[in-house]
Interface confidence: medium
């Protein structure tokens, strides 16, 4: 006769491991008992369990409640056992020793491999600001056994670097994603992808990029200078900028206080019916936590009764 087993049994942490040991004997042969032991190199054999044809399954106190026979129907020549709820410490070499009559004893070894799936974590880097050089956007760490694979999935241009730390029964892998921040990256997803033989599918953690910036400010509303004349209603100036975080707007007049009746509504400055006292230099001040910008314009309200033309100067200052 001969023993049938597996060279390697692979199981995911927490699952049940079937340790196979089947005696394929000649007719009339009987299995008296099957002894299972752990036989890691450098250590003595530690009994796991013993299946006896007469006395049944005996389990070592160290494995009490964790070793069972497979569910019926059972073949009397089958000495397989189930190791419940596999833990990392179960990984190692096991020996099955079968005592048969009249052929004698047979033994076989197998290796139990316990896969420990990773629980990845993603840590964003420092705040990203436009104008910085190469900056850490995020790091992703995953620990498992064997070592997991950590990669990045993104449309953003950047560079990656990885390092690995080996522990006694596992390995931790950390991958960093570096980039040169630009406003076009705002709202873009940066996804850490972790692959491992113990996972049914890749694990993905997505971080949305936020890049602080503030665009140059400009003022609209003075494009047609002939519209800025005494008596005109609905005249307005609009300050244009964009930023992350979204900016706030403030209007002032450089050559004095804002005239009465002028309404400030965020980025817009609304005028009552125009008079010559509305002529002056107006400043839009745009700011967010990252930066601030100014843009100033000169308003010259025309008196239609005068022949002189209206002159408008546009000046931007940062």
């Amino acid at each position: 006769g001969e023993l049938e087993t597996s060279d390697v049994v692979t199981v995911v942490l927490g699952q049940d491991a079937k340790l196979p040991c089947f005696y394929r004997g000649d007719s009339g042969e009987q299995v008296g008992q099957v002894a299972w032991a752990r036989v890691d190199a450098g250590e003595g054999a530690q009994e796991l369990a013993l299946l006896h044809s007469k006395y049944g399954l005996h389990v070592s106190p160290a494995y009490e409640g964790r070793v069972e026979q497979p569910p019926p129907p059972r073949n009397p020549l089958d000495g397989s056992v189930l190791l419940r709820n596999a833990v990392q410490a179960d990984e190692g070499e096991y020996e099955c020793r079968v005592s048969t009559f009249p052929a004698g004893s047979f033994q076989a070894r197998l290796r139990l491999r316990v896969l420990v799936p990773p629980l990845p974590s993603l840590n964003p880097g420092p705040a990203l600001e436009e104008g910085q050089g190469l900056t850490l956007a995020a790091s992703c760490t995953a620990e498992g056994s064997p070592a997991p694979s950590v990669t990045w999935d993104t449309e953003v241009k950047g560079t990656t670097s990885s390092r690995s730390f080996k522990h006694s029964r596992s390995a931790a892998v950390t991958s960093e994603f570096h980039l040169v921040p630009s406003r076009s990256m705002n709202g873009q997803p940066l996804t850490c992808v972790v692959s491992h033989p113990g996972l049914l599918q890749d694990q993905r953690i997505t971080h949305i990029l936020h890049v602080s910036f503030l665009a140059e400010a400009s003022v609209r509303g003075l494009e047609d200078q002939n519209l800025w004349h005494i008596g005109r209603e609905g005249a307005m100036l609009k300050c244009l900028s964009e930023g992350q975080p979204p900016p706030s707007y403030n209007w002032t007049r450089l050559d004095g206080p804002l005239p009465s009746g002028v309404r400030v509504d965020g980025d817009t400055l609304g005028f009552p019916p125009l008079t010559t006292e509305h002529s002056g230099i107006y400043v839009c001040h745009v700011s967010n936590e990252f930066s601030s910008r100014d843009s100033q314009v000169t308003v010259d309200v025309l008196d239609p009764q005068e022949d002189s033309g209206k002159q408008v100067d546009l000046v931007s200052a940062s």
Partner: nanobody, 118 residues
Amino acid sequence: EVQLVESGGGLVQAGGSLRLSCAASRSTFSLNIMGWYRQAPGKQREYVATITSGGSTNYADSVRGRFTISRDNAENTVYLQMDSLKPEDTAVYYCTAELVRRGPTTYWGRGTQVTVSS
């Protein structure tokens, strides 16, 4: 030939404890399985518990959680700690040992009486 000698039996009240011992006349390392059976008056011999040379154990459902089998290979002795005894545990308790070579050879002791009164 292996001689097995039991001791520790006696009379005890329900809920009490006893510890049986079985000494073997040769090294228990070569004895693959040792254990205990019992036989009540007018009944068949009944399996109680067994222990392997490596310390793995098995129990009959009727005693699981109340009885504990242990083994001292250095002293060539097997023990049965019996707690929470019940009147239905009254029987003659026999030590058994099995040697595995080309075929199983089973040895028996002469038995020790355990009586549990209510």
